[in-house]
């Protein structure tokens, strides 16, 4: 999928609200120190791909995280801010039939959580990078939202 | 107004290395990723790495990665990327540029490094 | 890697001329690719974004398409002051790389 059309603020926004706190929920109980991010991007329509490819691809160590609360919220904010999104997911939602019905959290999980978290983290530049900034703020910025 | 100013034109002998700043203004510094690109005498561009102000997390492509160092001063809104061990080859000029969305939509006016003997 | 393979090289074209220069890539890179003018001692300068979305303040004359992992410039009618090289740039991940430019000269 394309995600280069994604209205980026608003994912910010709906990731903020309610993804951010059900990821932090799923890792309830390991520190953050507990996994190396091995898992990057390096602008936001690529953290994105990364993201999706994380949540919603299964692998043989970890085959359930499509079905968790923060994937569905995933695919919600993504078929909602993201053109022509949803109409990509048909395969994607198939494979989450297939997925394991257990609820183990293996380790493995926990581990592709943590680098979603950080996947996440990298997404998110304009809100939280810029509470208690003493650098200059995007007010003149206007490279910053143009192309929405 | 958006803003990236680098410093001025190095002559360096080989095995030196060579420090290049790149002050941002204008913008918040660490909402955009910070990206280094090469241009070689009469060449095209090459895409040496990037760091992310943030937090400093650098990604550098292979042939960079034992010549190249990528710094941010988060105080001074300053970017640096660090030259070790040069050579001739490494003559050329080099450009800072942000990114948000993975074009450039700002660049440095470009710093040239001569490495002469 | 993914490659980009940009051609032609070189052109020549006179003022008011129609100029398309194409960008292919190794891979499927959906949109993820701008396009650039660099001028003698200068910095690129910024033109088309996302494949086909025009940078501000760029003319009109300038516009950017896809098919595949084709990408294309399209200068519609050229001007004096586009007579400059032109780069692509992917940005699929990374190592990004560039094109090899296109050098547009007069006629």
């Known amino acids: 999928y394309d995600f280069t059309n994604c209205d980026f603020q608003k994912i910010e926004a709906d990731y903020l609200r309610t993804i951010s706190k059900d990821l932090i929920t799923y890792m309830s109980g390991t520190k953050s120190t507990d996994f190396n991010n091995t898992v990057s991007c390096s602008n936001r329509p690529h953290c994105l791909t990364e993201i999706q490819s994380l949540t919603f691809n299964p692998t043989p160590r970890c085959a359930s995280l499509a079905k968790e609360m923060f994937a569905r919220k995933t695919k919600a904010t993504l078929a909602l801010w993201c053109p022509g999104y949803s109409e990509t997911q048909i395969n994607a939602t198939q494979a989450m039939k297939k997925a394991r019905k257990s609820k183990v959290t293996t380790n493995k999980c926990l581990e592709q959580v943590s680098q979603l978290l950080g996947l996440w983290r990298r997404f998110i530049r304009t809100l939280l990078k810029q509470q208690g900034s003493s650098d200059y703020k995007d007010d003149d910025d206007k490279h910053h939202h143009h192309h929405h | 107004e958006v803003q990236l100013v680098q410093s001025g034109a190095e002559v360096k002998k080989p095995g030196a290395s060579v420090k290049v700043s790149c002050k941002a203004s204008?913008?918040?510094?660490?909402?955009?990723?910070m990206h280094w690109v090469k241009q070689a005498p009469g060449q095209g561009l090459e895409w040496m790495g990037m760091?992310?102000?943030?937090?400093?997390?650098?990604t550098l492509i292979q042939k960079f990665k034992d010549k190249v160092t990528l710094t941010v001063d988060k105080s001074t809104s300053t970017a640096y990327m660090e030259l070790s061990s040069l050579r001739s080859e490494d003559t050329a000029v080099y450009y800072c540029?942000?990114?948000?969305?993975?074009?450039?939509?700002?660049w440095g006016q470009g710093t040239t490094v001569t490495v002469s003997s | 890697d993914i490659q980009m393979t940009q051609s032609p090289s070189s052109l020549s074209a006179s003022v008011g001329d129609r100029v398309t220069i194409t960008c292919r890539a190794s891979?499927?890179?959906?949109?993820?690719l701008a396009w650039y003018q660099q001028k003698p001692g200068k910095s690129p300068q910024l033109l088309v974004y996302?494949?086909?979305t025009l940078a501000e303040g760029v003319p009109s004359r300038f516009s950017g398409s896809v098919s595949g992992t084709q990408f294309t410039l399209t200068i519609s009618s050229l001007q004096p002051e586009d007579f400059a090289t032109y780069y692509c740039q992917h940005h699929y991940g990374t190592p990004w790389t560039f094109g090899g430019g296109t050098k547009v000269e007069i006629k």
């Open positions: 760091i992310d102000p943030s937090d400093s997390e650098t």
């Open positions: 996302f494949a086909k």
């Open positions: 540029a942000r990114t948000l969305d993975g074009y450039y939509d700002y």
């Open positions: 204008g913008y918040t510094f660490t909402t955009y990723w």
């Open positions: 891979e499927n890179i959906y949109s993820y």
